[in-house]
Interface confidence: low
């Protein structure tokens, strides 16, 4: 940026170099150039000369005034027109920033994804600040009263090995930037209650010919947690509304869930699980598509990942990978 230039004078900003977006600000330039009584002082913003709201204060100083400054960043510098100098002489420059103080962090959430070895804490940071904002995550054991602090710019992964103060903790987040500091409420957690089981994945689907054809969804998880509750949601891709089935699950074997679906319709399925009775769910799994056969079955030709159907005695869809997970709700 502009901070490394050799100055022949001084440039400063009131109320500050970093200020609240939308404020009125004044930028002052004071020349200190040998053998120069400046005829004129000029201001440049991002390389473009400003023409308005410039006031000469005295022989060596001028002020540039901005009303309702809304740019997150700008490089300012000023120059002097010196007698006997053909070109303007650079006086000094400064990078300025505008933004907002942080909002109070809320929705502080800490989870341990099974097998990750980390406790992941996230929060809603609120509105965009536009300026450098840091977060300090405080983790205080309710058993030993020991407190640890972690500095981050977004979320934080804390190794579970470093959580030596028992099972119960208070977690809170401080947000700070040049314009202010805010602190979240305290979240009380128990490490055993925030574990999210290893991701559940739908591996394949098949529709079996019968008096009433039925579709079987095969799904599994590598979790070692014994008591797991899961939800599978499904809908025709043309619908807005999901249907949800609930399961109490033991993942010692691949799960098979039966659905009686309309023929010749493309459906989408997702699954998610939680440790039974606990607070946090997995995000919904990748979208899994399956099209049911027409009512009069024909011979199966082939099966294909995610978005395939074939009429026949058995119609199968096989998952070989993950699409982007949709954990916000409906898809079109």
């Amino acid at each position: 940026g502009i901070t490394n230039i050799n100055c022949s004078g001084h440039i400063w900003v009131e109320p500050a170099t970093i200020f609240k977006m939308g404020m009125n600000i004044s930028i002052y330039c004071q020349a200190a150039i040998k053998n120069c009584q400046p005829r004129k002082l000029h201001f440049y913003k991002n390389g473009i000369k400003e023409r308005f709201q410039i006031t000469r204060i005295n022989k060596t100083t001028a002020r540039l005034w901005y009303k309702n400054f809304l740019e997150p960043h700008a490089s300012m510098y000023c120059t002097a027109e010196c007698p006997k100098h053909f070109q303007e002489t650079l006086i000094c420059g400064k990078d300025i920033s505008s933004g907002y103080p942080p909002d109070i962090p809320d929705e502080v959430t800490c989870v341990i994804y099974e097998y990750s070895g980390n406790m992941t804490c996230t929060w809603n940071a609120g509105k965009l600040t536009y300026i450098d904002t840091k977060y300090v995550v405080h983790v205080k054991s309710l058993e030993t009263e020991e407190e640890q602090q972690y500095l981050t710019s977004s979320y934080i992964n804390i190794s579970t090995d470093s959580l030596q103060g028992g099972k119960k903790y208070l977690v809170w987040v401080q947000a700070a930037n040049a314009l202010g500091m805010e602190e979240s409420k305290q979240l009380q957690i128990h490490l055993d209650d925030i574990v999210i089981p290893s991701a559940a994945v739908i591996s394949r689907a098949e529709t079996i010919n019968a008096t009433v054809p039925k579709t079987i969804i095969y799904w599994d998880s590598q979790t070692t947690i014994e008591k797991v509750s899961c939800e599978m949601r499904y809908k025709a891709t043309t619908n807005q509304t999901w249907n949800v089935k609930e399961f109490d699950t033991n993942f010692t074997y691949v799960q098979q869930s039966e659905f009686y679906l309309e023929p010749n319709i493309k459906y989408v399925f997702q699954v998610r699980c939680q440790e039974t009775g606990k607070r946090y769910w997995q995000p919904w799994s990748s979208l899994f598509f399956h099209k049911t056969p027409e009512t009069v079955p024909q011979v199966t030709s082939k099966a294909f990942q995610h978005d395939t159907w074939n009429s026949g005695l058995t119609v199968a869809s096989i998952s070989t990978g993950h699409l982007t997970s949709d954990n916000r709700g409906d898809i079109g």
Partner: antibody, heavy 121, light 112 residues
Framework: EVQLQQSGAELVKPGASVKISCKAS????????MNWVKQSHGKSLEWIGN????????SYNQEFKGKATLTVDKSSSTAYMLLNSLTSEDSAVYYC??????????????WGQGTTLTVSS | DIVLTQTAPSVPVTPGESVSISCRSS???????????LYWFLQRPGQSPQLLIY???NLASGVPDRFSGSGSGTAFTLRISRVEAEDVGVYYC?????????FGSGTRLEIK
């Protein structure tokens, strides 16, 4: 209307245990911490501890660890305090009082009517 | 533990006059978030305590604005202007900056 209805007065013998209840109504029980406070006759108030009904997490004043055990029954929106190995020192009025889920909002905004415990042989 | 000291066991007051009740803390109750975690309660004879003031200066719901709280990090005052007969009872300060929450010994307000 928020109400905390406590169980009636108790007269118990030294060495025995007693379980005091506090039934909450008029708000979502699991959204607020429940505090318990002791007031000995003619004396000030002492905070015993609190319980987070959502998780069942408890925090105790060290003075009451081993003396008081706090539990909840979410289905009936009731908080309980079990006091064991009772002595005459435990004779007091015990209050339940609602507090925010988090330590830095309004605490103790609603109180039960109190349960009088008398320990005597 | 944080100790709260209420030096005056009782204060006599004439109805209609103002009165101040003081409370001192052994540790600053000013949190880094700018809040001061001191509460005031009134316990009328034969009743449960009632919240009057939270976070040093905030008036609890339903409490008359004759009551006000002020203070620094360690010295606090509850002021009652135009005292009424129904204001009699014991006034307690309480900190909930840190566990264990602690109460002052109480100051009894008596009508002359």
């Amino acid at each position: 209307e928020v109400q905390l209805q406590q169980s009636g007065a108790e007269l118990v013998k030294p060495g025995a245990s007693v379980k005091i209840s506090c039934k909450a109504s008029g708000y979502s029980f699991t959204d607020y911490i429940m505090n318990w406070v002791k007031q000995s006759h003619g004396k000030s108030l002492e905070w015993i501890g609190n319980i987070n009904p959502y998780f069942g997490f408890t925090s105790y004043n060290q003075e009451f660890k081993g003396k008081a055990t706090l539990t909840v029954d979410k289905s009936s929106s009731t908080a309980y305090m079990l006091l064991n190995s009772l002595t005459s020192e435990d004779s007091a009025v015990y209050y339940c009082s609602r507090g925010s889920y988090y330590g830095y909002e309004t605490f103790f905004d609603y109180w039960g009517q109190g349960t009088t415990l008398t320990v005597s042989s | 533990d944080i100790v709260l000291t209420q030096t005056a066991p009782s204060v006599p007051v004439t109805p209609g006059e103002s009165v101040s009740i003081s409370c001192r803390s052994s540790k600053s109750l000013l949190h880094s978030n700018g809040n001061t975690y001191l509460y005031w309660f009134l316990q009328r004879p034969g009743q449960s305590p009632q919240l009057l003031i939270y976070r040093m200066s905030n008036l609890a719901s339903g409490v008359p604005d004759r009551f006000s709280g002020s203070g620094s990090g360690t010295a606090f005052t509850l002021r009652i202007s135009r005292v009424e007969a129904e204001d009699v009872g014991v006034y307690y300060c309480m900190q909930h900056l840190e566990y264990p929450y602690t109460f002052g010994s109480g100051t009894r307000l008596e009508i002359k």
